[in-house]
């Protein structure tokens, strides 16, 4: 058993049928020693009495708020949570397998630029009864400081008779120098507790392998005299790093028919521009990618043809 | 039909085609190296993150781009900014002082150089010669050192009477070429900063 | 104590459906995932299904999938088996199981795929 | 294709010990433990060893597990003629949990 936050506790049980539990020692946070009864969530039932209460928890029955009195009066709290271990493997119930990019994985990581800032995402179906807590820190033995807001629903989705909901949290790198070398990665861990189940979810990552740039900005088509041809111009987006000449970008210019089938024309390019050849009723897209370490690609930026 | 690819133009900077090389050379080995010793661990995620030129270079402080200087974060360790020398500089009209970021490379190329022809000569003698270590690479390293120009001590490479165990060689190769590869990022961005510059 | 008993086994043709099911007593059955396990005669054990706690979630075996669904009815205790397309090569000793770090397992059921 | 690979069959005298060795890799026994079972003819398989080393109550001592890197082993120490019977070793892959991996099965013989 281990203190989650004040007057909280999480009971770890190895879950099978018949397992025999665990022994807990509940201790009222009293100066008193006499008269003390003991009694679980809204039940009047009496489950004790004494200044300690020793109970055996086994199952989510056992668990919950277990409150000593005296008197009819309220003299403390303790809530009691469960975390499955499930034939050695922490039980995942709360959320989401987002098999993305591989199996196994709960949470995503992005980050728009190497300032040290990140979002990461969640899924689950649970709508109620459920809070998350978030911490970070980069490394592990030695951690350093990476300070975490609150996590919010963000989205709401529905998949066939399902509802999903997403929940998403922002995290800063206390002191990052956006040129630096990662040798440690960022460890995000998250709490999640539903209703009396307590799971914890872990991520770990370097800043560099979750870069996704924001889509280039202001995209713009010049057409060329007596020409099919157009000429295309982008700028870098604005939440990328600075300076461009260090933190270079490379790009792919794609010329898209209305149909899906239609075969795509694309180009890669360094530069800011491209000239391509702009077909009725097409659309042209650019995406945007670090230019030596190859992380994800932007999400397109397009405008229509005409 | 697939559009040409718009090559970049290698500008006044002589070193930044030899960078760009250099990039390529380690990545395509790396990804050859996890796709050969897939039952070793070579991925991102399962080795220790190790830096052979720790304490002993500063690439990453000595070339810090001249914006980057404000940041406290970036300042930690870093004792000199950029002072000038070497041949990839084709003009003397550079606003900022270099030949410590510049020198500071080629030292890192020069350790990495010996690290990677003492692990080839013993992945020589594995039995099994599951792994070797790309000529291309070698040579990308050396035509970049060469094109720096720095005058320095010669590394002798170290040699090893004891017989070597396989399995730590391939793993110490995958620690290597992720660490050389990060490196040669960071050079890829200072070429292209100064090349800009 | 913690009792499966299965039920459901039998001989049927190539191509035919066979329905196993396995009754729970003994243990709070909604509570814990279970799993399929068979074993073709003389050969060794291989996985076949899992299904989680409450049915959100259900993983197969690379041979029986897109022919065999696991389900549960935690109302009535009982894990299901509902077997689709059989082929001679399915024919073997079906086990149910718990899943936890100490597992039950049901007595076995024989089902025969021969025509 | 998810499989331990074990030895076809052991064999030792009464008294003496035996080893069954469950060879796997990174993603199944090198990130997870290590079950061990034992099965009489016509009888379902039993546990003997759990979360690599662990014996459930009722399981003699002379049975014992081990893991180390990608494999596992069963040791039974003092073999008697009551422990002829296939034994089986069991773990999940990393990223398919809860898809379960059995070992390819050891018939151990009391001469």
């Known amino acids: 058993i281990w203190e989650l936050k004040k007057d909280v506790y999480v009971v770890e049980l190895d879950w099978y049928p018949d397992a025999p539990g665990e022994m807990v020692v509940l201790t009222c946070d009293t100066p008193e020693e006499d008269g003390i009864t003991w009694t679980l969530d809204q039940s009047s039932e009496v489950l004790g009495s004494g200044k300690t209460l020793t109970i055996q928890v086994k199952e989510f029955g056992d668990a919950g708020q277990y409150t000593c009195h005296k008197g009819g009066e309220v003299l403390s709290h303790s809530l009691l949570l469960l975390h499955k271990k499930e034939d050695g493997i922490w039980s995942t119930d709360i959320l989401k397998d987002q098999k993305e990019p591989k199996n196994k994985t709960f949470l995503r990581c992005e980050a728009k630029n190497y300032s040290g800032r990140f979002t990461c995402w969640w899924l689950t179906t649970i709508s109620t009864d459920l809070t998350f807590s978030v911490k970070s820190s980069r490394g592990s033995s030695d951690p350093q400081g990476v300070t975490c807001g609150a996590a919010t629903l963000s989205a709401e989705r529905v998949r066939g008779d399902n509802k999903e909901y997403e929940y998403s949290v922002e995290c800063q790198e206390d002191s990052a120098c956006p040129a630096a070398e990662e040798s440690l990665p960022i460890e995000v861990m998250v709490d999640a507790v539903h209703k009396l189940k307590y799971e914890n979810y872990t991520s770990s990552f370097f800043i560099r392998d979750i870069i996704k740039p924001d889509p280039p900005k202001n995209l713009q088509l010049k057409p060329l005299k007596n020409s099919r041809q157009v000429e295309v111009s982008w700028e870098y987006p604005d939440t990328w790093s600075t300076p461009h000449s260090y933190f270079s970008l490379t790009f792919c210019v794609q010329v898209q028919g209305k149909s899906k089938r239609e075969k795509k024309d694309r180009v890669f390019t360094d530069k800011t521009s491209a000239t391509v050849i702009c077909r009725k009723n097409a659309s042209i897209s650019v995406r945007a990618q670090d230019r030596y370490y190859s992380s994800s690609w932007s999400e397109w930026a397009s405008v229509p043809c005409s | 039909r697939n559009l040409p690819v718009a090559t970049p133009d290698p500008g006044m900077f002589p070193c930044l085609h030899h960078s760009q090389n250099l990039l390529r050379a380690v990545s395509n080995m790396l990804q050859k190296a996890r796709q050969t010793l897939e039952f070793y661990p070579c991925t991102s995620e399962e080795i220790d993150h190790e830096d052979i030129t720790k304490d002993k270079t500063s690439t990453v402080e000595a070339c810090l781009p001249l914006e980057l200087t404000k940041n406290e974060s970036c300042l930690n360790s870093r004792e000199t900014s950029f002072i000038t020398n070497g041949s990839c500089l084709a003009s003397r009209k550079t606003s900022f002082m270099m030949a410590l970021c510049l020198s500071s490379i080629y030292e890192d190329l020069k350790m990495y150089q010996v690290e990677f022809k003492t692990m080839n000569a013993k992945l020589l003698m594995d039995p099994k010669r599951q792994i070797f270590l790309d000529q291309n690479m070698l040579a990308v390293i050396d035509e970049l050192m060469q094109a720096l120009n720095f005058n320095s001590e010669t590394v002798p490479q170290k040699s090893s009477l004891e017989e070597p165990d396989f399995y730590k060689t391939k793993i110490k190769l995958c620690i290597l070429l992720h660490a050389f590869r990060i490196r040669a990022v960071t050079i890829d961005r200072v070429m292209s900063y100064l090349n800009a510059s | 104590q913690v009792q499966l008993v299965q039920s459901g086994g039998g001989v049927v043709q190539p191509g035919r459906s066979l329905r196993l099911s396995c009754a729970a007593s003994g243990f709070t059955f909604s509570s814990y995932g279970m799993h399929w396990v068979r074993q073709a005669p003389g050969k060794g054990l291989e996985w076949v299904a899992f299904i989680r706690y409450d049915g959100s979630n259900k993983y197969y075996a690379d041979s029986v999938k897109g022919r065999f669904t696991i389900s549960r009815d935690n109302s009535k205790n009982t894990l299901y088996l509902q077997m689709k397309s059989l082929r001679a090569e399915d024919t073997a000793v079906y086990y149910c199981?718990?899943?936890?770090?100490?597992?039950?397992w049901g007595q076995g059921t024989m089902v025969t795929v021969s025509s | 294709s998810y499989v331990l690979t074990q030895p076809p069959s052991v064999s030792g005298t009464p008294g003496q010990r035996v080893t069954i060795s469950c060879s796997g890799g990174r993603s199944n026994i090198g990130s997870n433990t290590v079950k061990w079972y034992q099965q009489l003819p016509g009888t379902a398989p039993k546990l003997l060893i759990y979360?690599?080393?662990q014996r459930p109550s009722g399981v003699p001592d002379r049975f014992s597990g081990s893991k180390s890197g990608t494999s596992a082993s069963l040791a039974i120490t003092g073999v008697q003629a009551e422990d002829e019977a296939d034994y089986y070793c069991?773990?999940?892959?990393?990223?398919?949990?809860?898809?379960?991996?059995f070992g390819t099965g050891t018939k151990v013989t009391v001469l």
């Open positions: 979360g690599n080393d």
């Open positions: 069991q773990s999940y892959d990393r990223g398919t949990h809860p898809l379960t991996i």
């Open positions: 199981k718990t899943h936890g770090s100490h597992d039950n």
